[in-house]
């Protein structure tokens, strides 16, 4: 188990990264002046306590911000939110924080996101561009819920 | 309101076993955990183990290992404790307790009144 | 197993201030134990004051405050008010499973 978040660098399957725009997460096109967030990850310490087989429950922040992403209800709909927090916080808790933690399923070289809170909602991005990232429950659809990972340092 | 209401007291045999439950209102336990603790007369709390509804894992003190189950109805919003081969020592008052995580830490927000229960031939 | 030690009683005077403290057998507390601290009044029901060693729980007055001190977890009571007589417990956590003390009988006199 990992005692230090891991940096990695994410995008989409049509190259498109994570960009932070007034605290909210966008994936835009890899462009020369486009600087993309760092994401920090790190497993949750209560694997055990989890279900198995759905995934590696990770914490995802974005390194050096002191920001995490959550999930919660907005209305009757799960929303994916960034929060003020240290995600070393969040991975030093007594228990899973659920809201803030997702299950990494890896495929091959695509990895999903699935809310622990919210079993069957998964981190996407709009087919179009410069869209929010949001949570959905429609894989393959209009979203896209496949990125791929590439760890740094 | 947040509630959470127990079931009733029991005077049981030793060796007998006993199934207290614990009925949540205003929240639904799926969205949190739910902690079992025990206050035997005159002496202090004593944390048996907990219950994540949602999935269904537990954790358990290693004394009540094997002497405590827990589990959840998540249907009905309800959540168990059993206890078995009682003996006069388990006679105690049973708690439950969400602990909830609130912005940045985890707390036990809320409880049951207790449930009496007495081991006695 | 470790054991969690607490003043068996302590008195205020209405207006005071206290503290109660929490001992672990294993050594120094720290903020990885996570100290809860729990009340108990006469004929009603427990309430959470403090989780994870120092944050008040959502609608606990101002005057409950949580800490380390002296190697011990605290919980700091200024401007006691006859309502606080209680009995207070503290929890700590190791590693997977969490430790009650005996609990601290507060009278306010």
């Known amino acids: 188990k990992s005692e230090m978040p891991q940096p990695v660098s994410i995008q989409d399957i049509n190259h498109r990264v994570w960009v932070l725009q007034d605290q909210i997460l966008i994936a835009v096109p890899r462009k020369d002046r486009v600087s993309p967030v760092t994401i920090s990850l790190i497993s949750c310490r209560h694997v055990e306590t989890l279900e198995k087989d759905r995934g590696n429950p990770i914490y995802l922040g974005l390194n050096g911000l002191n920001l995490c992403l959550m999930c919660a209800k907005a209305g009757d709909q799960p929303t994916l939110q960034l929060k003020e927090k240290d995600i070393m916080d969040l991975y030093n808790q007594p228990e899973p924080v659920k809201s803030f933690l997702f299950y990494h399923s890896q495929s091959g070289r695509n990895s999903t996101f699935e809310s622990v809170a919210f079993p069957g909602w998964f981190i996407a991005v709009s087919s179009e561009g410069g869209c929010p990232l949001i949570l959905t429950q429609e894989l393959g659809k209009a979203n896209t819920t496949d990125f791929g990972l590439t760890m740094l340092f | 309101q947040v509630q959470l209401v127990q079931s009733g007291a029991e005077v049981k045999k030793p060796g007998a076993s006993v199934k207290v439950s614990c009925k949540a209102s205003?929240?639904?336990?799926?969205?949190?955990?739910i902690y079992w603790v025990r206050q035997a007369p005159g002496q202090g709390l004593e944390w048996i183990g907990r219950?994540?509804?949602?999935?269904?894992?537990?954790r358990y003190d290693p004394k009540f290992q094997g002497k405590a189950t827990l589990t959840a109805d998540t249907s009905t919003n309800t959540a168990y404790l059993e206890l078995s081969s009682l003996r006069s020592e388990d006679t105690a008052v049973y708690y439950c307790?969400?602990?909830?995580?609130?912005?940045?830490?985890?707390?036990?927000?809320?409880w049951g009144q207790g449930t009496l229960v007495t081991v006695s031939s | 197993q470790a054991v969690v030690t607490q003043e068996p009683s302590l008195t205020v005077s209405p207006g005071g201030t206290v503290t109660l403290t929490c001992r672990s057998s294993?050594?120094?507390?720290?903020?990885?134990?996570?100290a809860n601290w729990v009340q108990e009044k006469p004929g009603q029901l427990f309430t959470g004051l403090i989780g994870?060693?120092?944050d008040r729980a959502p609608g606990v007055p101002a005057r409950f405050s949580g800490s380390l001190l002296g190697g011990k977890a605290a919980l700091t009571l200024s401007g006691a008010q006859p309502e606080d007589e209680a009995d207070y417990f503290c929890?700590?956590?190791?590693?997977?499973?969490?430790?009650f003390g005996g609990g601290t009988k507060l009278t306010v006199l």
């Open positions: 307790a969400r602990y909830d995580y609130s912005g940045s830490s985890f707390y036990f927000d809320y």
């Open positions: 205003g929240f639904n336990i799926k969205d949190t955990y």
């Open positions: 219950i994540d509804p949602a999935i269904g894992t537990t």
């Open positions: 294993t050594g120094a507390v720290t903020t990885s134990n996570y």
């Open positions: 994870g060693t120092n």
């Open positions: 929890a700590l956590w190791y590693s997977n499973h969490l430790v």
